[in-house]
């Protein structure tokens, strides 16, 4: 941080290294929950129109993508992934790209990803091709 | 050298007005994704707006969005902030600062990323 710069104890909108050099804030979709038509697709476009400075600098950018018996939804947001969100660990939250894994909840769909670039929760990807977790 | 400089600041009243300035100099500024940042008293950075070098696409913080408008003039190595509908809230400090896109972190603190700052003061 320059020397001008206050820097504030026991905040966390600023994030700084040993050498005192400042992280940027992740740019993310931000679009809450919407109603989505994407299924039965290896990726699908958000189609979220917002894109928001991340208030955080630790902050990813996450979908969560649900189906169940009346509707398909696609929420965008940004977050801590030191927090668990909707009750997950973002365990791919250092991902370049939305990589889609199904999680276990009852009486749904449930898929859930993270990442760590620009925007990257503006494309979700389903296909397997992608994912990095398949003992094949 | 690198140069930062805002301009534009001062003591507003609630659902007032402001425009600030930041001039750059000494580096290439078409190449450098540009912020404003604002650090209220005793408080942590918040990072308000950016703007891409080429394009003009702009992002905002969930609390000025509609309210605050960035833009830049890359023949006058000029960024601007109009900052409408002003709250006590906003009151702060306001710096300009540079980013490569794509590159998460600043070199480091000693390194020419910062304007000096001007102080907005938003009360009746």
């Known amino acids: 941080i320059p020397p001008h710069v206050q820097k504030s104890v026991n905040n966390d909108m600023i994030v700084t290294d040993n050498n005192g050099a400042v992280k940027f804030p992740q740019l993310c979709k931000f679009c809450d929950v919407r109603f989505s038509t994407c299924d039965n697709q290896k990726s699908c476009m958000s189609n979220c129109s917002i894109t928001s400075i991340c208030e955080k600098p630790q902050e990813v950018c996450v979908a969560v993508w649900r189906k169940n018996d009346e509707n398909i939804t696609l929420e965008t947001v940004c977050h801590d992934p030191k927090l668990p969100y909707h009750d997950f660990i973002l365990e791919d939250a250092a991902s370049p790209k939305c990589i889609m894994k199904e999680k276990k909840k009852p009486g749904e769909t449930f898929f859930m990803c993270s990442c760590s670039s620009d925007e990257c929760n503006d494309n979700i990807i389903f296909s397997e091709e992608y994912n990095t977790s398949n003992p094949d | 050298e690198v140069q930062l400089l805002e301009s534009g600041g001062g003591l507003v009243q609630p659902g007032g007005s402001l425009r600030l300035s930041c001039a750059a100099s000494g580096f290439t500024f078409t190449e450098y994704r540009m912020w404003w940042v604002r650090q209220a008293p005793g408080k942590g950075l918040e990072w308000v707006s950016a703007i891409e070098p080429i394009g003009n696409r702009t992002y905002y913080a969930r609390s000025v969005v509609g309210r605050f408008t960035i833009s830049r003039d890359n023949s006058k190595n000029t960024l601007y902030l109009q900052m409408n509908s002003l709250r006590a809230e906003d009151t702060a400090v306001y710096y300009c600062?540079?980013?490569?896109?794509?590159?998460?972190?600043?070199?480091?603190?000693?390194?020419?990323?910062w304007g000096q700052g001007t102080l907005v003061t938003v009360s009746s």
């Open positions: 600062a540079k980013q490569i896109p794509g590159r998460k972190w600043t070199a480091n603190s000693r390194f020419d990323y």
